[in-house]
Interface confidence: medium
């Protein structure tokens, strides 16, 4: 299945001299990503990232998804994608619409994870998963 709608985004990985991420954060395309080793519900994951001055990751390009999947270590991670039941659509936490494919959809699965599979997977918001946080590189 096609995960993303077709896009002309031809991003490549660049690392500018002097651009840094905090210890244990991963750098990609001027952003820093933190893959937690602990787990919690989606709401607590959102707060966890907020406490680190970041947000749950917005994985809105195929390149970003591939980068993160390459480092997710055979685990599932919450990302900043939630299902708005009243609109019947998935939105990123910055409110942009996600028109791609989410597998494992279920009326009780209103949050999403990546890792383990090559797709975005719907998941219960109340079950504990690891989480990916994202913020600007300095």
């Amino acid at each position: 299945p096609q995960i993303f709608n077709k896009s002309n985004d031809g991003f490549t990985t660049t690392r500018s001299y002097g651009t840094v991420c905090p210890k244990d954060w991963e750098f990609y395309q001027a952003r820093c990503f933190f893959l937690s080793t602990s787990e919690s519900s989606w709401n607590e994951s959102r707060d966890f990232c907020k406490g680190k001055g970041s947000t749950l990751a917005i994985v809105n390009t195929p390149e970003k998804l591939k980068f993160l999947q390459d480092i997710t270590d055979a685990e599932k991670y919450f990302i900043g994608l939630i299902y708005h039941r009243e609109e019947k659509r998935w939105r990123w936490i910055n409110n942009s619409v996600f028109n791609g494919n989410v597998t494992n959809q279920n009326q009780n699965f209103n949050c999403a994870t990546i890792g383990l599979t090559k797709t975005f997977d719907a998941a219960s918001c109340d079950i504990s998963y690891r989480r990916i946080c994202e913020k600007n590189a300095k």
């Epitope: 937690s36 080793t37 602990s38 787990e39 919690s40 519900s41 607590e44 966890f48 685990e75 109340d126």
Partner: antibody, heavy 122, light 112 residues
Framework: QSLEESGGDLVKPGASLTLTCTAS?????????MCWVRQAPGKGLEWIGC???????TYYASWAKGRFTISKTSSTSVTLQMTRLTAADTATYFC????????????????WGPGTLVTVSS | AIVMTQTPSSKSVPVGDTVTINCQAS????????LAWFQQKPGQPPKLLIY???TLASGVPSRFKGSGSGTHFTLTISDVVPDDAATYYC????????????FGGGTEVVVK
């Protein structure tokens, strides 16, 4: 590979105490949890809380929140700080490692220390 | 918080027989059936027997078998030997946002 707890003592009600768990033959892995479990004399096991080594996140049993604090002090030691101790806290305190099994994160405590006895009495 | 209820609290079993210990969770354990079983002998720390419901820990004999899902779990010990005399505990993991782990009350197995 082994774990050893230290710091157990006889203390008075209301006192504070810090227990240390030291690993020998290995360093804590980023993906593992270090946890504390206690056992009152002649009673069952009671889970206290865990620390995720990789990101420092801690979580606790509801009765332990605010009074017990788990911290990582080095790549081979964690502590359990206990405050406002009462006679009900008298127990053997165990530290245990919970590896994050790939793909499921299952909490099987695969390595335990022998325990250290804490007695709270006036 | 999740509550784990073990039955029976004590069981006497002849050498060579099979013993079954039940563990019921007050709510479904977290994903992938995160239920573990431990064996504890007097004066010793617990020893991991089984994790994620049915996976045998390293070095544990295949006489020990874990099964179940959701809220009902079972530990079965077949061909019981004297060395199996111990207290057995189940432990369930519900997730960090719901007070984490909880142990059952224990089942003492006496081998006749």
């Amino acid at each position: 590979q082994s774990l050893e707890e230290s710091g157990g003592d006889l203390v008075k009600p209301g006192a504070s105490l810090t227990l240390t768990c030291t690993a020998s033959g290995f360093s804590f892995s980023r993906s593992s949890y270090m946890c504390w479990v206690r056992q009152a004399p002649g009673k069952g096991l009671e889970w206290i809380g865990c620390l995720s080594v990789g990101d420092g996140h801690t979580y606790y049993a509801s009765w332990a929140k605010g009074r017990f604090t788990i911290s990582k002090t080095s790549s081979t030691s964690v502590t359990l700080q206990m405050t406002r101790l009462t006679a009900a806290d008298t127990a053997t305190y165990f530290c245990a490692r919970a590896p994050s099994y790939s793909g499921d994160g299952g909490h099987g405590y695969d390595l335990w220390g022998p325990g250290t006895l804490v007695t709270v009495s006036s | 918080a999740i509550v784990m209820t073990q039955t029976p609290s004590s069981k006497s079993v002849p050498v060579g027989d099979t013993v079954t210990i039940n563990c019921q969770a007050s709510e479904s354990v977290d994903r992938n059936n995160r239920l573990a079983w431990f064996q504890q002998k007097p004066g010793q720390p617990p020893k991991l027997l089984i994790y994620t419901t049915s996976t045998l820990a390293s070095g544990v004999p295949s006489r020990f078998k874990g099964s179940g899902s959701g809220t009902h779990f079972t530990l079965t010990i077949s061909d019981v030997v004297p060395d199996d005399a111990a207290t057995y505990y189940c432990a369930g993991y519900r997730g960090a946002h719901t007070d984490g782990d909880a142990f059952g009350g224990g089942t003492e197995v006496v081998v006749k």
